[in-house]
Interface confidence: medium
């Protein structure tokens, strides 16, 4: 059911763009899943607007979202996780716009954490490691990670490395000597589930050794 409000109180609704986007997070709180939706136009007047999800739910036909400032949010165990759900923006009982969405195709993983970089002097390389909560999950276990690093002075010159493991080796000779680097990592579903990049992990900063003049190697 989609359409626009037609009664007198809701005439202004016809002028608004109620486009919205959503992402799901599975087993984000124990066995609880979450679904977060927000309007694409930040200036939409959200007073009296509600979100509702129907279909592909266990035990119930529909669920209402909670409103948290400008986002709408559900935390539940009741997502079926196979099949499309109908997500609607509503004013009272009237649906203003609806989207059919399979929650397994809009998964946003949790951000990786515990990012660290260790310099191995003998190997002349840097070992990057990080952790992800998804290793312990039943559903979204398989992720592709995007490690991005840059020299701190090069504001937009990021180098990206995609990997499926949580460990990466950076060769010393590929980095500038005596430089401060920033590194961060994010994740995206990479098997049965589809969706969006997670938020970036907190950045980690490390300095490369200076060049040893006699050997041409970094200290």
């Amino acid at each position: 059911e989609s359409g626009y409000a037609q009664n007198g109180d809701l005439e202004d609704a016809e002028l608004d763009d109620y486009s919205f986007s959503c992402y799901s997070q599975l087993e984000v709180n124990g066995s609880q899943h979450s679904l977060t939706c927000a309007f694409e136009d930040p200036d939409v007047n959200t007073t009296n607007l509600e979100f509702e999800i129907c279909g592909a739910l266990v035990e119930v036909k529909c669920l209402n979202f909670r409103k948290l400032q400008e986002i709408y949010f559900i935390e539940t165990k009741k997502f079926l996780l196979i099949g499309k759900s109908n997500i609607c923006v509503k004013v009272g009982e009237k649906s203003l716009t609806c989207k059919k969405i399979d929650l397994t195709t809009i998964v946003k993983p949790e951000a990786p954490f515990d990012l660290s970089v260790i310099y191995r002097e003998g190997a002349n390389d840097f070992v990057v490691t990080f952790n992800t909560s998804h290793l312990q999950k039943k559903y979204v276990k398989v992720l592709m990670h995007d490690v991005a690093y840059r020299q701190e002075k090069d504001e937009n010159k990021w180098t990206h490395v995609n990997l499926s493991s949580t460990k990466l080796t950076l060769l010393q000779r590929k980095l500038q000597p005596a430089a401060m680097y920033e590194i961060k990592v994010r994740s995206i579903p990479d098997h049965y589930f589809k969706g969006f990049w997670s938020e970036w992990s907190p950045s980690y900063y490390f300095r490369t050794p200076e060049i040893n003049n006699s050997s041409g190697e970094m200290d």
Epitope: L57, V58, E59, V60, K61, L80, L81, I82, G83, K100
Partner: antibody
Framework: EVQLVESGGGLVQPGRSLRLSCAAS????????MHWVRQAPGKGLEWVSG????????GYADSVKGRFTIFRDNAKNSLYLQMNSLRAEDTALYYC??????????????WGQGTTVTVSS | AIQLTQSPSSLSASVGDRVTITCRAA??????LAWYQQKPGKAPKLLIY???SLESGVPSRFSGSGSGTDFTLTISSLQPEDFATYYC???????????FGQGTRLEIK
């Protein structure tokens, strides 16, 4: 009118293959998971296989795993069951069924009339 | 897959009787249960979903109840057209899996 029409059944020798088809009409096919359910003569219902709307979720009963393959063509509004290495115990009436998960979870709200598969030498 | 056991396997009753069929799950499945009716030579027909919700077009003499492991299908006053075989059904969403009970045959006494 919502309709499912199965075809492709017949008499086949043990070890041979058969492909069942199910033509869907009257509903938005690619919004729904679909299933195959069979019923041996004089026996109860046995779920055989199911496939999600986008073919990414697929399941099989243990009795057919590794021998049967379910697939769908949303452009043709069609569901298929490829049955290999057929055995006498696969003899049954095979139903195609539409999944209506808006009911709250997997419920099979529309069924075809069935197609008969007989495996015998 | 979760095992579903229906009881009785068959029963005889008369028109006007109140009939109860039970379905027991080997482990808790909350309210994720449906009931179907099948008449000889016909495809099954959905009666009840979500343990107690009546499918559109199904007479109100049919009702379902229960949650967890024990579920019941009740026909409050048997009509001649109700003599058939009844099946309960459960699901698992990941991996996708459906299980039927073995069926209960309801015959005219």
């Amino acid at each position: 009118e919502v309709q499912l029409v199965e075809s492709g059944g017949g008499l086949v020798q043990p070890g041979r293959s058969l492909r069942l088809s199910c033509a869907a009409s009257g509903f938005t096919f690619d919004d729904h998971a679909m299933h195959w359910v069979r019923q041996a003569p004089g026996k109860g219902l046995e779920w055989v296989s199911g496939i999600s709307w986008n073919s990414r979720g697929i399941g099989y009963a243990d009795s057919v795993k590794g021998r049967f393959t379910i697939f769908r063509d949303n452009a043709k509004n069609s569901l298929y069951l490829q049955m290999n290495s057929l055995r006498a115990e696969d003899t049954a009436l095979y139903y195609c069924a539409k999944d209506e998960y808006s009911r709250g979870y997997y419920v099979l709200d529309v069924w075809g009339q069935g197609t008969t598969v007989t495996v015998s030498s | 897959a979760i095992q579903l056991t229906q009881s009785p396997s068959s029963l005889s009753a008369s028109v006007g009787d109140r009939v109860t069929i039970t379905c027991r799950a080997a482990q808790g499945i909350s309210s994720a249960l449906a009931w179907y009716q099948q008449k000889p030579g016909k495809a099954p027909k959905l009666l009840i979903y979500d343990a107690s919700s009546l499918e559109s077009g199904v007479p109100s003499r049919f009702s379902g109840s229960g949650s967890g492991t024990d579920f019941t299908l009740t026909i409050s006053s048997l009509q001649p057209e109700d003599f058939a075989t009844y099946y309960c059904q459960q699901f698992n969403s990941y991996p996708l899996w459906i299980t039927f009970g073995q069926g209960t045959r309801l015959e005219i006494k």
